[in-house]
Amino acid sequence: GSVKVLHEPSCFSDYISTSVCQWKMDHPTNCSAELRLSYQLDFMGSENHTCVPENREDSVCVCSMPIDDAVEADVYQLDLWAGQQLLWSGSFQPSKHVKPRTPGNLTVHPNISHTWLLMWTNPYPTENHLHSELTYMVNVSNDNDPEDFKVYNVTYMGPTLRLAASTLKSGASYSARVRAWAQTYNSTWSDWSPSTTWLNYYEPWEQHL
């Protein structure tokens, strides 16, 4: 039968080494067997490269394309093929479609004056454009009470957050996760980091009296 794209490719770049495109077919498809995404940088002498997509769901395909350290001028020509049939053609400028890498190594440490110090790693090396552009969102939630959660925006440079233990329920187990975005690139949010969990053992001041 005829092969058709239901939702055309949507692509994002981590702006360092990888661009990912995702699209939906009009019926369940074996993406790696039936489809190919070709990509070519619009630059004199560039070669055509081929990405073999994988299934994310029955009819959703994903392709991860290795790219060079991106620069603003880069524009890729993308062509989606089913054998000899061209299903879709478009262009993609990584600098205009940034999805930052996920922050890593989120840890929680007890700190002075009844505070918790949350720390994580910037996912970009210092020489990358995005290293100094990231701001973060930290989500802290009570594992046993879905209503008890807080969101913190970290807009300063360091990948840290100080959290007063008194702002959390004593004796409760909390989880934190962090994600990043790059304001100057008008990026989307990164995926959330894996959660880290700790017990808030702060004793409210009233209990001392």
């Epitope: 630059f43 004199m44 002498g45 560039s46 070669e47 620069v71 603003e72 880069d74």
Partner: antibody, heavy 125, light 112 residues
Framework: EVQLVESGGDLVKPGGSLRLSCVAS????????MTWVRQAPGKGLQWVSL????????YYADAVKGRFTISRDNAKNTLYLQMNSLRAEDTAVYYC??????????????????WGQGTLVTVSS | DIVMTQTPLSLSVSPGETASISCRSS???????????LDWYLQKPGQSPQGLIY???KRASGVPDRFSGSGSGTDFTLRISRVEANDTGVYYC?????????FGQGTKLEIK
């Protein structure tokens, strides 16, 4: 040692055809784009054509578009320039040169880093 | 098309002095920060051209540090310090950014 050796230059009548060859050695030929540059007697350098490493993409100067065809045989480490409908103004020494490395996603640029010795093409009746 | 304009077209310099050649392009040759697709070539009498500078400022292999390139965007300069008799020839700039590639008219350097 990286080396380029051109051949095929000759005296040919206007409207005639000629095929130039450039044999490469000392580097991984298929990884690099190749370029033809020409120089009319007593004149400056003029870019003619470029082909990427796989041969999948070609570029031409307006003066030769539709008349000249650049190609390559990576198995033989050889670059070609097929010249048809030759004109007096095509008279020049033709040089082949190694251009950018196109194996990477964004070609790595080193300028025209190796040149051949040139081959003379004379178009005259 | 990008037009390349060199000045001066000829230059006479005494040994040991510094020679400067300018090259201007009709469009910016900057692809990204630090990547200016402008080269300099020398053609000695009776020889094939040879690469001197690429990407505006990087010296080709084996080129002495007396040769230096600078500039960005549309304005570039080749400087040859402590000029020697062996430096005689015609110097060309070339843009390597987009098709059609293009050379300047050439600058003939003569050593007094």
């Amino acid at each position: 040692e990286v080396q380029l050796v051109e051949s095929g230059g000759d005296l040919v009548k206007p409207g005639g055809s000629l095929r130039l060859s450039c044999v490469a050695s000392g580097f991984t030929f298929r990884d690099y784009a190749m370029t033809w540059v020409r120089q009319a007697p007593g004149k400056g350098l003029q870019w003619v054509s470029l082909i990427n490493g796989s041969g999948g993409k070609t570029y031409y100067a307006d003066a030769v578009k539709g008349r000249f065809t650049i190609s390559r045989d990576n198995a033989k480490n050889t670059l070609y320039l097929q010249m048809n409908s030759l004109r007096a103004e095509d008279t020049a020494v033709y040089y082949c040169a190694v251009d950018r490395k196109t194996k990477t996603i964004r070609p790595q640029y080193y300028g025209l880093w190796v040149w051949g010795q040139g081959t003379l093409v004379t178009v005259s009746s | 098309d990008i037009v390349m304009t060199q000045t001066p077209l000829s230059l006479s310099v005494s040994p040991g002095e510094t020679a400067s050649i300018s090259c201007r392009s009709s469009q910016s040759l900057t692809y990204s920060i630090g990547y200016n697709y402008l080269d300099w070539y020398l053609q000695k009498p009776g020889q094939s051209p040879q690469g001197l500078i690429y990407l505006g400022h990087k010296r080709a292999s084996g080129v002495p540090d007396r040769f230096s390139g600078s500039g960005s965007g549309t304005d570039f300069t080749l400087r040859i310090s402590r000029v020697e008799a062996n430096d005689t020839g015609v110097y060309y700039c070339m843009q390597g950014l987009q098709s059609p590639l293009g050379f300047g008219q050439g600058t003939k350097l003569e050593i007094k």
